[in-house]
């Protein structure tokens, strides 16, 4: 079941999923100039058996001025450098990902993908936090979400950690104010996961996580 | 209570467009999807899209994604689908519904007819 | 997509009478939703996540099913139950509906 409302917002912090539960999809959305081809899924999809799990549909994007064709324009040195750097923390990723019954890793990248995934999870998904560079955790519990569902709406558990400044005093600041609203269901953002491209801060922060490598930003 | 009103019927004619407004109450509007729902006289229901309100995030069905719109206004609690090109196959009632899982609450229907 | 299959497109009942509508996806789904609409009014959530019924909906009103396979049941058909019924699902998008049961009087 599609979870109809997006992981909590927390200050100074992206999230990740480790794996993505059977069911969820991923939009095939390509970069400007580019476009999904005519006969392509919207969508790639978890979907597996009890001994394995993949994604469904491959995305394929091509030159929006082509006319039915698939032929793919050269790259220009930077979108070389951008592609490059996706592979790379691809591998990164699926060297760092376990497995789990039931999940899919991260999809490889595809041809002119767009800079920008945007997931649907569903019901049980959970996602990881993690304090950008520059901002140290202050954990009352668990650093995670995870999307359940109660009398048929979904709503995402409240991750416990508190971002704070490398300068700021260390004692233990205030709770951020929850990302839910008064009738009990978290605010409806996107879940949109950013793909960041600058290698060399990406390093940085893959060396400090303990579980898995961030290659993602919550937008 | 929560609430969804919709704006009243509208007749165009072909190849024009129309915008269709549906304002909330009774709960925090960024706090929920808004999907649209579409019914053409005398048949069933078919989902068109959402929008996140806070972000002004949408997902179309394929279907209908060079055909509406959805936008969102926070500072009004309303949500728009802009239907464009009509023709007279988009006659129909359309509805917003409030996400978050189920379609909990909906709103009465505009019923839009092109007609020349 | 998704495609669902509702059977009976119609079916005419009496006050009192058992009724079973059957909702079948071409792939399988986590759950089935029902709404009830009835004429120029908006639909109605009936029953969520395949058995629950909504707030304020008669136990009559009765939903089962796994996988590919789901019913709505009514156990005995009030007066009031005379409407359309729609299948749902949200597993996946697009997210789509059934092409409807309406149960008439008979």
């Known amino acids: 079941e599609l979870c109809d409302d997006d992981p909590p917002k927390i200050t100074h912090a992206t999230f990740k999923a480790v794996a993505y539960k059977e069911g969820t999809m991923l939009n095939c959305e390509c970069k400007r100039g580019f476009r999904r081809i005519k006969s392509g899924s919207p969508y790639m999809l978890c979907t597996g058996n009890s001994s394995h799990s993949s994604w469904d549909n491959q995305c394929q994007c091509t030159s929006s001025a082509a006319r039915n064709t698939t032929k793919q324009v050269t790259p220009q040195p930077e979108e070389q450098k951008e592609r490059k750097t996706t592979e790379m923390q691809s591998q990164m990723q699926l060297a760092d990902q376990v497995s789990l019954p039931g999940h899919c890793r991260e999809p490889p990248p595809w041809e002119n993908e767009a800079t920008e995934r945007i997931y649907h999870f569903v019901v049980g998904q959970t996602v990881y936090y993690q304090c950008v560079q520059g901002y140290r955790a202050l954990h009352r519990g668990p650093a995670e979400s995870v999307c359940k569902m109660t009398h048929g709406k979904t709503r995402w558990t409240q991750p416990q950690l508190i971002c704070t400044g490398e300068t700021e005093p260390s004692q233990f600041p205030g709770e951020e104010e929850p990302q839910a609203s008064p009738d009990g269901l978290p605010e409806s953002e996107t879940s949109r996961l950013v793909t960041t491209t600058d290698f060399r801060i990406q390093t940085e922060v893959a060396a400090t996580m303990e579980t898995f490598i961030f290659t993602t930003e919550y937008q | 209570q929560v609430q969804l009103v919709q704006s009243g019927a509208e007749v165009k004619k072909p190849g024009s467009s129309v915008k269709v407004s549906c304002k909330a109450s009774g709960y925090t509007f960024t706090s929920y999807r808004m999907h649209w729902v579409r019914q053409a006289p005398g048949q069933g229901l078919e989902w068109m899209g959402y929008?996140?309100?806070?972000?002004?995030?949408?997902e179309y069905n394929q279907k209908f994604k060079d055909k509406a719109t959805i936008t969102a206004d926070e500072s009004t609690n309303t949500a728009y689908m802009e239907l464009s090109s009509l023709r007279s196959e988009d006659t129909a009632v359309y509805y917003c519904?409030?996400?978050?899982?189920?379609?909990?609450?909906w709103g009465q229907g505009t019923l839009v007819t092109v007609s020349s | 997509d998704i495609q669902m299959t509702q059977s009976p497109s119609t079916l005419s009942a009496s006050v009192g009478d058992r009724v079973t509508i059957t909702c079948s996806a071409s792939?399988?789904?986590?759950?089935m939703h029902w709404y009830q609409q009835k004429p120029g009014k908006a639909p109605k959530l009936l029953i969520y996540?395949?058995?629950e019924l909504a707030s304020g909906v008669p136990a009559r009103f009765s939903g089962s099913g796994s996988g590919t396979e789901f019913t709505l049941t009514i156990s005995s058909l009030q007066p009031d139950d005379f409407a359309t019924y729609y299948c749902h699902q949200r597993s996946t998008y697009p997210l789509t509906f059934g092409q409807g049961t309406k149960v008439e009087v008979k």
């Open positions: 792939s399988s789904i986590s759950y």
């Open positions: 996540t395949t058995s």
């Open positions: 519904a409030r996400g978050g899982g189920v379609f909990d609450y």
């Open positions: 929008i996140s309100p806070r972000k002004g995030y949408t």
